[in-house]
């Protein structure tokens, strides 16, 4: 740690005195203190000398000596009082700038330590301090206003009692700055804009901050626009607003608009896009396939995206058949606005019934005309199966009818014993019918197919089963020949209720 000579914490001298302060360290040393006139600074090897041969009240202050090369950063200090009967205060600053909630040191240094008992802090022109001003005094450093507030930004004077009268210092202006958390907050409205050529448009760029020192500008395709600025102050924030008014837009007004605001903390920007079109437009689209297949009893949401300008004058969902003239319930139709010019319309179809298959159309209208988007909804069904015994061209034939969607595949099984359903251990023979005859195949309906199995003689202790399956499920029908005549068994599980 450096050593100061004279080795006293405080030194009191009279004006005009010669003062020499020597600092000695292991390495090079440096003096630091308030900038004040008349000091001469010179080095002599590992010592540094601070001297004046004509001390004035302005030399009052704390002088610190440091060793820049010392990693521990040790220092020594001495406080000098230049005791001037005419000047009780040495004011080191015209202005003090702090952030809110910091301590503000008003550097009125007392030139005579004896005066400490009679000091006070006042506002200029003898006005008292504001209520709740919490302050303390140090003869070495001055008055400290603790946790300074913005409202305490005032002009202050330090007062000392000398011979029964108050002697004031020159004034010190305290500037308490609001803590700026970051760049100004920005809004640019609208977020997106579409206009038909010749229409009017308005774009508003506004920025706000707790501090008045910030700049804001609006630019179009990287060109700064010259727009008069409106300023305001409310909710403890400064606001600056730029409003671009266009009476009749043209294609050159289209493009990217950016609102940019900056302060000492940095820059914020936000952008929007302005589209100028020749005429009204209305576009319908869907991310879904327009041809939908859903299993009966399940639900489906049909979604349509609408892009339109000007806004929609009307819209609705319509069921176009073929099963009934019912219309979708309005409560199942939902509209959400993604932004000003894009909307999503959803039709919810829960627990679909057979009569609800068919075409659903979304219709929308704006000044640009009508547009429609149609979905085709086909229901999927598991196969239903029935078997009968008949004679075709004199031959005994088992006839299997299977109905479902998608079109079912048919397999015949012959197994030993009488059973409702053949299991693997009983199977004697299997026939696949790759091409069953299609009896009916209409849009939105089930597909009915027929498969024939010619049997020369029915074995009485055996079962003939027709199985049909598709992507939804399977169905079967067991045919058991008995002496009194053929007997058929639909399987227990075939109790289908849509």
């Amino acid at each position: 740690i450096p050593v100061i000579e004279p080795s006293v914490p405080e030194l009191v001298v009279k004006p005009g005195a010669t003062v020499t302060l020597r600092c000695v360290g292991n390495g090079s040393v440096e003096w630091d203190g308030p900038p004040s006139p008349h000091w001469t600074l010179y080095s002599d090897g590992s010592s540094s000398i601070l001297s004046t041969n004509n001390a004035t009240f302005q030399n009052t202050g704390t002088y610190r000596c440091t060793e820049p090369g010392d990693p521990l950063g040790g220092s020594a200090a001495i406080h000098l009082y230049v005791k001037d009967p005419a000047r009780p205060w040495n004011v080191l600053a015209q202005e003090v700038v702090v952030f809110e909630d910091q301590d503000a040191l008003l550097p009125c240094l007392l030139t005579d330590p004896v005066l400490e008992a009679g000091v006070s802090l006042v506002r200029v022109r003898g006005r008292p301090l504001m209520r709740h001003t919490n302050y303390s005094f140090s003869p070495w450093h001055g008055f400290t206003i603790h946790r300074a507030k913005f409202i305490q930004s005032q002009d202050y004077q330090c007062s000392a009692l000398m011979g029964g009268r108050k002697v004031m210092s020159i004034s010190i202006r305290l500037k308490v700055q609001k803590v700026i958390p970051g760049p100004p907050a920005l809004t640019l409205v609208p977020a997106e804009l579409v206009r038909i050529r010749g229409e009017a448009a308005q774009i508003v760029c506004s920025a706000s901050s707790v501090d008045v020192n910030f700049d804001v500008f609006l630019q179009h395709n990287n060109t700064k626009l010259a727009i008069p600025q409106q300023s305001d102050f409310h909710n403890n924030r400064y606001q600056k607003v730029l409003t671009l008014n266009l009476d009749q837009v043209d294609f050159q007004h289209a493009g990217n608009y950016s609102c940019v605001a900056s302060n000492v903390q940095g820059k914020h920007s936000t952008s929007m896009f302005f589209r100028v079109v020749e005429s009204a437009y209305l576009n319908l689209s869907s991310e879904q396939n327009l041809i939908q297949e859903v299993t009966v009893g399940e639900g489906l949401n049909l979604k349509v995206m609408v892009e339109a300008y000007p806004g929609l004058q009307g819209f609705n969902w319509t069921y176009l058949g073929p099963f009934s003239d019912h219309q979708p319930e309005p409560k199942l139709a939902n509209a959400t606005t993604k932004d000003t010019y894009r909307h999503t319309f959803t039709l919810s179809l829960p627990r679909l019934k057979p009569s609800e298959a068919g075409r659903y159309s979304f219709l929308a209208r704006n000044p640009g005309g009508w547009r429609a988007l149609t979905f085709e909804l086909t229901l999927r069904y598991p196969p239903e199966v029935s078997v009968i015994w008949t004679f075709i061209n004199g031959s005994g034939t088992l006839l299997c009818a299977a109905s479902g969607y998608p079109q079912p595949n048919v397999t015949w099984l012959q197994c030993s014993g009488h059973t409702d359903r053949c299991d693997e251990a009983q199977v004697l023979q299997v026939w696949d019918d790759p091409y069953p005859e299609v009896l009916s195949q209409e849009p939105f309906h089930k597909v009915t197919v027929q498969s024939l199995l010619t049997v020369e003689t029915l074995e009485h202790n055996q079962t003939y089963e027709c199985r049909a399956h598709n992507s939804v499920g399977s169905g079967s029908w067991a045919f058991i020949p008995i002496s009194a005549g053929a007997h058929t068994h639909p399987p227990d599980e075939f109790l289908f209720t849509p």
């Epitope: 630091d32 308030p34 008349h38 600074l41 080191l92 003090v96 700038v97 040191l105």
Partner: antibody
Framework: QVQLQESGPGLVKPSETLSLTCTVS????????WNWIRQPPGKGLEWIGY???????NYNPSLKSRVTISLDTSKNQFSLKLSSVTAADTAVYHC???????????WGQGTLVTVSS | QSVLTQPPSASGTPGQRVTISCSGS????????VNWYQQLPGTAPKLLIY???QRPSGVPDRFSGSKSGTSASLAISGLQSEDEADYDC???????????FGGGTKLTVL
């Protein structure tokens, strides 16, 4: 070794506020006093003002009404704001560390600020 | 207009001694110490002399300063080509309560 680096916009419009920041590295801002000095093209150096580490400031009387110098000890930075600028404020702006006898022992490289519309 | 007065230019040949003057008033040079700065082209000013005649470490002893009354001077002996630069004088001014500068002297090494 103490180093100072100025930063801020190089172009400012007339009547707007010039804002510069000086970042100090290699030493603490919590001692000495920290100055802004400028040099208009082809002219001499002009002292703008200083801030002492405690937040105390003194400004050149010719600029006092337009200047604010502030300190951010947490970032080891100090800042200059000069309001209502005109073309006469076009200059290279330097930040510098001041010693108690009025000498400036460390300087920033300087940043040219042009005031123009 | 600078508060301290310096000649706008000075010149000398290598090896020569050159002196640059700086004059002020009682409120600055007359009552406070003088500092000199060297500014090489495109660089920041560098403290060359402080407290009238003190050299910071690293400054060659070819550079010396002196003060008398309200005037000061900077002498460069054994002039070298790398000394070609602008030289500025400065002093604390009591009425300004801050430092004042000269207009700068451009030294050319011929």
């Amino acid at each position: 070794q103490v180093q100072l680096q100025e930063s801020g916009p190089g172009l400012v419009k007339p009547s707007e506020t010039l804002s510069l920041t000086c970042t100090v590295s290699g030493g603490s801002i919590s001692s000495y006093y920290w100055n802004w000095i400028r040099q208009p093209p082809g002219k001499g150096l002009e002292w703008i003002g200083y801030i002492y580490y405690s937040g105390s400031t003194n400004y050149n009387p010719s600029l006092k009404s337009r200047v604010t110098i502030s300190l951010d000890t947490s970032k080891n930075q100090f800042s200059l704001k000069l309001s209502s600028v005109t073309a006469a404020d076009t200059a290279v702006y330097h930040c510098a560390r001041g010693r108690l006898n009025g000498a400036f022992d460390y300087w920033g490289q300087g940043t040219l600020v042009t005031v123009s519309s | 207009q600078s508060v301290l007065t310096q000649p706008p230019s000075a010149s000398g040949t290598p090896g020569q001694r050159v002196t640059i003057s700086c004059s002020g008033s009682s409120s600055n040079i007359g009552s406070n110490t003088v500092n000199w700065y060297q500014q090489l082209p495109g660089t920041a000013p560098k403290l060359l002399i402080y407290s009238n005649n003190q050299r910071p470490s690293g400054v060659p002893d070819r550079f010396s300063g002196s003060k008398s009354g309200t005037s000061a001077s900077l002498a460069i002996s054994g002039l070298q080509s790398e000394d070609e630069a602008d030289y500025d004088c400065a002093a604390w001014d009591d009425s300004l309560n801050g430092p004042v500068f000269g207009g700068g002297t451009k030294l050319t090494v011929l």
